[in-house]
């Protein structure tokens, strides 16, 4: 049986059940390399409380559909009067990066995971030439996830203080120059994640090979190497390589750009101070507020919730968008879709799509940007579920009693973008990270 998601095969992936202090290792095509779980374990559960290992999915007992992967075991689970076996179930959804498997829950018999990944899309529009896992768990099982930094087109311009050259990088994947053919990037070779531009020439100085690594708490490292043997004539016989160190700042701050800290014989060292390198719980909330010791800030968007069936309306040329954030009130146009954002075609109001659901909500405050994300909406033809990204700006003189209103700014590949000026986005900082 062929591997169902070949682009995910090269790595052993990790997921965590934080509630029970359990680390899962997952290899969807072969077996994880953990002796204690046996030679054919595809899903190995490491219980850090008891320092024990249990195989909860066997690579030999795999069954797959386009969107579901199940690994059975021969271990019986004591559900009364049944003959069930312990198994793992991974539900795949289309995403714009390789993504990460997320632990959902576990019953007596089944360990459930969900994975939003390019590998599950119906079309190849989001697939990279080369992409590596872009997250890591630290020794306290806290997740550090750089997936939001991955550019689907274009690249980051590294601050290198050299007027003659420009170094461009992407995070965890190669630079896509076709979707955004910026004049400088157009010459970058396919597959490169680090592209050195000199005049009208561009050189591949690194491609992703290994996934993100944690070197110590709040310092993550990504390494790129030039795979093919052909040496560049300005590298003094050395093979080019790029090391990017992502640093979580010691306190809340605005975002910075990546900086070149050392260069010698085409070995480039880059440091990037970004809050995306901090653990995810520091940046994100599933509710509409971020507060407490953990986050160093106080943010509460719940006053933006609309009651009594009314919604915010944002005009998007062909479409009207109805938004109801931070609540669970059904939008009338999107009745029974559990939509937080509802897209209605102006020329045919029967054409209605959920552009993100209220129970699929993430509030994120990172590098000075406050964003509310609603995902899991109706599918587009690519298989990607529509989502909405609302970027908030602090405005103490916003109309509508300080609430302001969302403004539609555009759509890219079934992701809908809004900006929203409101006094409720004014962030109060604490100082004890």
């Amino acid at each position: 049986q062929a591997a169902p998601f070949p682009e995910l095969c090269s790595y052993t992936w990790e997921a965590v059940d934080t509630k029970n202090n359990v680390l899962y290792k997952i290899n969807i095509c072969g077996s994880v390399d953990i002796v204690q779980c046996g030679p054919s374990s595809a899903v190995c559960m490491h219980d850090l409380k008891t320092r024990t290992y249990h195989s909860v999915g066997d690579s030999v007992l795999r069954s797959a559909t386009r969107s579901l992967l199940e690994f059975n075991t021969t271990v019986s689970c004591d559900q009364q009067g049944t003959n069930h076996r312990v198994q793992s179930s991974i539900a795949f959804l289309c995403g714009k990066t390789l993504g990460t498997p997320e632990f959902v829950t576990a019953t007596e018999c089944v360990h459930y995971f969900e994975w939003r990944t390019t590998a599950a899309c119906k079309k190849d529009i989001f697939k990279a030439n080369k992409e590596v896992p872009c997250y890591v768990f630290d020794e306290e099982l806290r997740k550090h996830d750089l997936n939001p930094l991955i550019k689907l087109s274009g690249a980051y311009d590294v601050d290198d203080s050299d007027p003659d050259t420009s170094l461009f990088i992407n995070v965890c994947r190669d630079i896509d120059t076709l979707r955004d053919p910026g004049s400088q990037l157009r010459a970058c070779p396919p597959g490169t994640a680090a592209c050195l531009v000199r005049g009208h020439q561009a050189f591949d100085v690194g491609q992703p090979r290994d996934g993100l690594k944690v070197v110590r708490k709040d310092r993550l490292v990504l390494s790129y190497v030039r795979e093919e043997a052909g040496k560049l004539d300005f590298c003094d016989g050395h093979s080019p390589a790029v090391t990017i160190t992502f640093v979580c700042p010691s306190e809340r701050r605005e975002g910075t750009i990546p900086k070149l800290t050392a260069k010698s014989n085409c070995r480039y060292e880059i440091e990037w101070i970004t809050e995306y390198a901090c653990h995810r719980d520091y940046l994100e909330s599933k509710t509409c507020s971020l507060s407490g010791e953990q986050q160093d800030v106080s943010i509460d968007l719940t006053p933006l919730a609309q009651s009594g069936g009314s919604s915010y309306i944002s005009d998007g040329k062909e479409y009207l968008f109805y938004l109801n954030v931070c609540g669970e009130t059904e939008i009338q146009f999107c009745n029974k879709k559990q939509a937080a954002v509802c897209q209605v075609k102006k020329s045919d109001t029967s054409q209605v799509k959920a552009a993100g659901r209220y129970h699929n909500q993430t509030l994120r405050y990172s590098d000075g940007d406050l964003t509310l994300i609603y995902f899991g909406g109706d599918e587009c033809s690519s298989g990607f579920q529509r989502m909405s990204v609302i970027n908030f700006e602090c405005n103490k003189t916003a109309g509508n009693d300080g609430k302001g209103t969302p403004v539609f700014t555009g759509e890219v590949d079934c992701t809908y973008f809004f900006t929203w000026d409101t006094e409720y986005a004014c962030v109060h900082h604490h100082h004890h990270h």
Partner: nanobody, 116 residues
Framework: QVQLQESGGGLVQPGGSLRLSCAAS????????MDWYRQAPGKQREWVAT???????TYADSVKGRFTISRDNTKNTVYLRMNSLKPEDTAVYYC??????????WGQGTQVTVSS
């Protein structure tokens, strides 16, 4: 005051059965992961069984197929049903509660002796 109290231990013949109980107070019981451990005289404390907050269960190889862990959230109690007991099961049995927001909480222990 967060507390765990074990009960149900005692003297039993080889091949016999016992049911240990661990009653919790002062915690949201269903949010907690519950573990049973045991400590035989002169030996280190060893893990016996786990019942996670979600419901999955795991057992040490030495008790697999003989012991069953379960919980009753309405009574804030976790149980350890022990069948086919062996002399090497003789130990003090402890229950432990843990969650991301609490430090681990241990009970005082209950003595189980398997002897003819």
């Amino acid at each position: 005051q967060v507390q765990l109290q074990e009960s149900g231990g005692g003297l039993v013949q080889p091949g016999g059965s016992l049911r240990l109980s661990c009653a919790a107070s002062g915690i949201i019981f269903s949010d907690n992961r519950m573990d049973w451990y045991r400590q035989a005289p002169g030996k280190q404390r060893e893990w016996v069984a786990t019942l996670a907050s979600y419901g999955w269960k795991t057992y040490a190889d030495s008790v697999k197929g003989r012991f069953t862990i379960s919980r009753d959230n309405t009574k804030n109690t976790v149980y350890l049903r022990m069948n086919s007991l062996k002399p090497e099961d003789t130990a003090v049995y402890y229950c432990k509660a843990s969650s991301p927001v609490l430090n681990d909480i241990w009970g005082q222990g209950t003595q189980v002796t398997v002897s003819s």
